[in-house]
């Protein structure tokens, strides 16, 4: 990444398209949910990030290479009754017209009698929606992410059974203080009671339907996190995600 422009703009918390390239680490992670190389584990001889091209490139069709952005799916379809299926997703009632991969398997409503098939690890996502709003919209949120990952997700529960969705107050890292930046125009002493600007949500992947219909399922959350980062790079996320992490051995009550 030769550009001084990009050196100045990297890691300032905002995606600058001119720097949104592999050479510039996707603007230092600003375009990729803070993940500087989503393809780090991809051992293909191809530069798989350059092959998101609406055609199948088998050398990139592995979990580590993010399943070639699911471009190798033979029967890639869109959900026929999308509005209906969105409204009835994960409502504890099986709608067979929504029980397909493209419709998110009705949020597993038709698979309640099947054993769960959890991917190893936890997805930890920061999203710029306060917890109450995110929880209110959780079915749509989980459906949107599930559509990108071609599987089902659920909010993790802590040891007391509470949903692991926590208020997020923003970062006070050096990166966020670049160019003397402060998130608010208030003096430091007034920043003690910062307002909630988002949520940190802990998610699990349940592959119980994915493994029946596909061989492109995430065995762990690392590649799933990387795929979300890849969607961020492409600008195809429908929610204001800020960061994504994968924790393969996560504590149940971590905040």
């Amino acid at each position: 990444c030769q550009s001084q422009y990009c050196a100045d703009k990297a890691r300032d918390g905002i995606c600058d398209e001119a720097c949104n390239s592999h050479a510039c680490q996707w603007d230092g992670g600003d375009c990729s949910l803070t993940m500087e190389d989503p393809w780090a584990n991809c051992t293909s001889t191809l530069r798989c990030w350059e092959y998101i091209n609406n055609q199948c490139d088998e050398q990139c069709n592995t979990a580590e290479c993010l399943f070639d952005n699911f471009e190798c799916q033979r029967n890639s379809k869109t959900c026929k009754y999308d509005k209906y299926c969105a409204d009835h997703f994960k409502d504890n009632h099986c709608d067979q017209g929504c029980n397909s991969e493209e419709c998110g398997w009705d949020g597993l409503d038709c698979a309640s009698d099947q054993p769960e098939n959890l991917a190893e690890g936890t997805l930890i996502i920061v999203v710029l929606l306060p917890p109450e709003q995110l929880l209110q919209d959780s079915r749509s949120f989980l459906r949107a992410l599930g559509t990108l990952l071609h599987t089902n997700l659920r909010i993790k529960q802590d040891s007391q059974g509470a949903l692991m969705v926590y208020p997020y107050f923003g970062e006070k890292s050096a990166a966020m203080k670049k160019q003397k930046m402060t998130r608010r125009s208030l003096p430091e002493e007034q920043e003690q009671e910062q307002e909630v600007i988002g949520s940190k949500i802990f998610l699990e992947i349940d592959n119980r339907q994915c493994v029946q219909d596909s061989d492109q399922c995430f065995k762990n959350t690392d590649a799933a996190a990387a795929l979300l980062a890849s969607h961020a790079i492409q600008g195809t996320l429908s929610y204001p995600l800020v960061s994504v992490f994968s924790e393969l051995e996560s504590p149940r009550n971590a905040q």
Partner: antibody, heavy 122, light 107 residues
Framework: EVQLVESGGGLVQPGGSLRLSCAAS????????MSWVRQAPGKGLEWVSY????????YYADSVKGRFTISADTSKNTAYLQMNSLRAEDTAVYYC???????????????WGQGTLVTVSS | DIQMTQSPSSLSASVGDRVTITCRAS??????LAWYQQKPGKAPKLLIY???IRASGVPSRFSGSGSGTDFTLTISSLQPEDFATYYC?????????FGQGTKVEIK
Amino acid sequence: EVQLVESGGGLVQPGGSLRLSCAASGYTFSSYGMSWVRQAPGKGLEWVSYIYPYSGATYYADSVKGRFTISADTSKNTAYLQMNSLRAEDTAVYYCARHSGYYRISSAMDVWGQGTLVTVSS
Amino acid sequence: DIQMTQSPSSLSASVGDRVTITCRASQSVRSFLAWYQQKPGKAPKLLIYRASIRASGVPSRFSGSGSGTDFTLTISSLQPEDFATYYCQQYYISPWTFGQGTKVEIK
């Protein structure tokens, strides 16, 4: 309904200061970037400054760098433009405009305020 | 800075005419180009983004095309409410820059 309302414009002498406000409503303020764009009387549009409220990242046009400061208060859903050392050539209608992409600076401005007039004259 | 040059600066047309406005960037802006419409005394309104995608609520008679350095805004059949000034804007590299505007007047 997404809405932006500017205020704070007025008449100021050269060398003086003014602070413009842009009150946002109808969306999650911290999720979207905000720019100030100005238009001198009878002239075209000129981008002035940008802020991403979540991270505080700021960008400026060379013509205002060192004189203008953009900021945001996420608790008030308001963006500000502090204008110091004002010059006659800063006379313009100032618009605040929301960028359409969540965390992407490289996005078009999809919602605009009605504008506030700043006149710099002795 | 990237210079944006619009042509023509002004044009006269009649209702029902097909109108084409061009915008040229001094270097590639890929497809990161927007078109705005502005009427006297009003704020600009987003018409087209990403060079060719119509913004929400924009009539289908407006279309955009191009990538790299050369872009076009076309109004397929001019309506009375379309008489206004049109600006292109690149949002690829900051500072974001606008064209000088094209005023569409009634013939």
